[in-house]
């Protein structure tokens, strides 16, 4: 039994890091493998993660972590019974994938303006709370070509757009994701999408 693709891990910079790897053949990850992880400091405890299957030869492990700080560094040991298959280390602050924003709401009752709001996925004491920027994806359910991305580079979890920038009388969906430039993070997963019917008063045209 050998590791084909070494574990790569990402942290939500709060409570979970997720590690994925591939074995050289079909593996029952939960019965055959264990990933041990330990914070590098004196008297720290070793924790054991039971991996789950992620495709035939793929495994995934969710590592529970206490509040992450930038100095945290973990040793990782992948075992198959008594055999050490791989040894490595992981610094959560250097491999961050933020949590997805939540509670995306489209407010359509503001005169011909669409106000999209969502919630920051971090509590105020978390370092990422004040460092997230967002991308909002809006698309038409009727027309696959009507697909747009708005970059929200300010900290406020909201976006205002004129309803007239979208077609009237059709349904749209929106979703939002986050990233933090300060930690050079990857993008978060997209939030669940929300749907609304876009309608606004067409301006009276004189001929």
């Amino acid at each position: 039994m050998k590791v084909l693709q070494e574990p790569t891990c990402v942290s939500d910079y709060m409570s979970i890091s997720t590690c994925e790897w591939k074995m050289n053949g079909p593996t029952n990850c939960s019965t055959e493998l264990r990933l041990l992880y330990q914070l590098v400091f004196l008297l720290s405890e070793a924790h054991t993660c039971i991996p789950e299957n992620n495709g035939g030869a793929g495994c995934v492990c969710h590592l529970l972590m206490d509040d992450v700080v930038s100095a945290d560094n973990y040793t990782l040991d992948l075992w198959a019974g008594q055999q050490l298959l791989w040894k490595g280390s992981f610094k959560p602050s250097e491999h961050v994938k933020p949590r997805a924003p939540g509670n995306l709401t489209v407010h359509t009752n503001v005169s011909d303006t669409l106000l999209l709001t969502w919630s920051n996925p971090y509590p105020p004491d978390n370092y990422l709370y004040n460092h997230l920027t967002y991308a909002v994806n809006i698309w038409s359910e009727n027309d696959p070509a009507d697909f747009r991305i708005y970059n929200v580079t300010y900290r406020e979890p909201s976006l205002r757009i004129a309803a007239s920038t979208l077609k009237s009388g059709i349904s749209y969906r929106a979703r939002v994701r986050a990233w933090a430039q300060c930690y050079n993070t990857t993008w978060s997963e997209w939030s669940p999408s929300t749907k609304w019917h876009n309608s606004y008063r067409e301006p009276f045209e004189q001929h």
């Epitope: 409570s15 979970i16 914070l39 400091f41 004196l42 008297l43 720290s44 405890e45 789950e52 969710h62 529970l64 972590m65 206490d66 509040d67 992450v68 700080v69 949590r99 997805a100 939540g102 509670n103 996925p121 509590p123 105020p124 004491d125 978390n126 997963e189 939030s191 669940p192």
Partner: antibody, heavy 115, light 107 residues
Framework: QVQLVESGGGLVQPGGSLRLSCVAS????????MNWVRQAPGKGLEWVSY????????YYADSVKGRFTISRDNAKNSLYLQMNSLRDEDTAVYYC????????WGQGTLVTVSS | DIQMTQSPSAMSASVGDRVTITCRAS??????LAWFQQKPGKVPTRLIY???SLQSGVPSRFSGSGSGTEFTLTISSLQPEDFATYYC?????????FGQGTKVEIK
């Protein structure tokens, strides 16, 4: 091995105060965020409060906000819960529980609020 | 605040039965969900975290699934020592909230 031992429970009248303690051993307390969780007699679990190892930030359940204060003394390996303006509905066994996500619990201390 | 609704609140089952307990969150919590077991007079112990990750030392007959707002704890073949109360917990945001509990009793 990890051990959490709560103390300070007892009988108190409505409107009174009590201070619970939780002494930790078997791990580096200063590196762990901590929680208080309670359970009223015959009822379910209710999260009460949290204190971060990283920032010292604190969070509370709405039911205790403004009345309870969580704190810690890393030099004494101790977690505290100062409970003021106690009500009948605060009667419960109070547990301290370690992060991440309540991996270890103490045995609990019973707080009875009654006149 | 996020509400966690567990069902059923109580159930009777026999040794060897397959038992399923569900937990519904009032809003999306991704996979930030854990399951705990509590036996009478004892302290709760964590069975599952991150919705589907089995806690080390917990028998493999316990499994968890779900994401977003719908979650399930399954006991594939109920054993005598599994008669207890089970709680779900969301730790997606503060305040953290538990489900009201499911008591699994002997039929």
């Amino acid at each position: 091995q990890v051990q959490l031992v709560e103390s300070g429970g007892g009988l108190v009248q409505p409107g009174g105060s009590l201070r619970l303690s939780c002494v930790a051993s078997g791990f580096t307390f200063s590196h762990s965020s901590m929680n208080w969780v309670r359970q009223a007699p015959g009822k379910g679990l209710e999260w009460v409060s949290y204190i971060s190892r990283a920032t010292g930030a604190v969070y509370y359940a709405d039911s205790v906000k403004g009345r309870f204060t969580i704190s810690r003394d890393n030099a004494k390996n101790s977690l505290y819960l100062q409970m003021n303006s106690l009500r009948d509905e605060d009667t419960a066994v109070y547990y301290c529980a370690r992060e991440p996500v309540f991996d270890y619990w103490g045995q609990g201390t019973l707080v009875t609020v009654s006149s | 605040d996020i509400q966690m609704t567990q069902s059923p609140s109580a159930m009777s089952a026999s040794v060897g039965d397959r038992v399923t307990i569900t937990c519904r969150a009032s809003q999306d919590i991704s996979n930030y969900l854990a399951w705990f077991q509590q036996k009478p007079g004892k302290v709760p112990t964590r069975l599952i975290y991150a919705a589907s990750s089995l806690q080390s030392g917990v028998p493999s007959r316990f499994s968890g699934s779900g994401s977003g707002t719908e979650f399930t704890l399954t006991i594939s073949s109920l054993q005598p020592e599994d008669f207890a109360t089970y709680y779900c917990l969301q730790w997606s945001s503060y305040p953290r909230t538990f489900g009201q509990g499911t008591k699994v009793e002997i039929k």
